[in-house]
Amino acid sequence: KKVVLGKKGDTVELTCTASQKKSIQFHWKNSNQIKILGNQGSFLTKGPSKLNDRADSRRSLWDQGNFPLIIKNLKIEDSDTYICEVEDQKEEVQLLVFGLTANSDTHLLQGQSLTLTLESPPGSSPSVQCRSPRGKNIQGGKTLSVSQLELQDSGTWTCTVLQNQKKVEFKIDIVVLAFQKASSIVYKKEGEQVEFSFPLAFTVEKLTGSGELWWQAERASSSKSWITFDLKNKEVSVKRVTQDPKLQMGKKLPLHLTLPQALPQYAGSGNLTLALEAKTGKLHQEVNLVVMRATQLQKNLTCEVWGPTSPKLMLSLKLENKEAKVSKREKAVWVLNPEAGMWQCLLSDSGQVLLESNIKVLPTWSTPVQP
């Protein structure tokens, strides 16, 4: 008996071939001997089966001795043994229809779980293997689960169902809803404007939800909500916003926040959360602000940084075009009685300069000038 695998919702064509290459009488029946369709001369006739409105044949092939049964919009319950009667012969074809669906939605938040469920006919024992867009293979039976979805899991998942040495392939498009970056650090000199951007890693036609930025200033003992906003069809409207700092938010996507100036009291880290309509859970992006200040008070030249810096970062004070006078893995360095000239304060990571502030030290009889 020939086995054919079909996909729920698809169309299948079951073949039946006579030895004579001409149009002769044929019938297709199901395992209960109920007629599905056949012919009377050049006319297609249909029987009382449940497939009535979904069954068809190709009249153009009858003259060649081919009498296919075409079943449209396949259902799991169409799984059956179909019998073609032609020339006093019976050809049996076993049709097995499978369906593969994602748990609730194909748009899932980063960190959520994806469950793929296989619908299969009674008596079948299929195996399933799925390949994610990043090449990860998962195997299972009736259900397959992937926990902690990552951004790289966005795209087309290809799943192969194997039964009786035959296979059928499903393709499911999964969209992982996330920000492009999980975390970012902005390095600024005191007084500079600060821009925070929160680009999304997905595009949907209508994006509605609400968000909030919580900020933990380094010198504060608790975090504060700096801004709350609504998102309606990709348009941003601010509900409540702090005035210290005078935070501003762009009205369109990508989500964009501006601090008019970087100040030590604002240095710290923030967490922007976005709750999307009809989704449980929230998207998160962390932002960090590091602020540098170089000052000269009397005979002391000081350079300080505030905010979340890694212990391996180096803070240095050097006279332009000279070796560093002081270089430490600390958040403040100073030079007593600095000589006149343009001094540079540098925050660097393995030799790469992340932040630089220049301060001009004048001869001792005059006051310092900050460029």
Epitope: A217, R219, K224, V241, Q243, D244, L263, Q265
Partner: nanobody
Amino acid sequence: EVQLVESGGGSVQPGGSLRLSCGASGFDVDYYAIGWFRQAPGKEREGVSCIASSDGSTYYADSVKGRFTISRDNAKNTVYLQMNSLKPEDTAVYYCAADATCPYYCSGSVCYLETGMDYWGEGTLVTVSS
């Protein structure tokens, strides 16, 4: 250790003036934002005024605008609240508090001072009555 001590409270007649002081120890007053808050008997604590660190921006509750003035003396490590044209409804315990930033927020065109700050003083009583 961060400590805040309020002084200058007392009794005054309507229309009178008082100057409250907030002395800080354990930190420099220009390092933190300092706010003044008040709580009248049987009422919730409310924001009065706040002065930001570094640039010294000032914020006031609508109910005290034009009557109260906040200022800072870095040398004395003290923040002041000058209260003029006092009204009976100004009667309350006045607290000073410190944080990295002033909890001054706007919703549309309505702006207000919230009470969320990190460090608090014990308070000083101001009574306005004839």
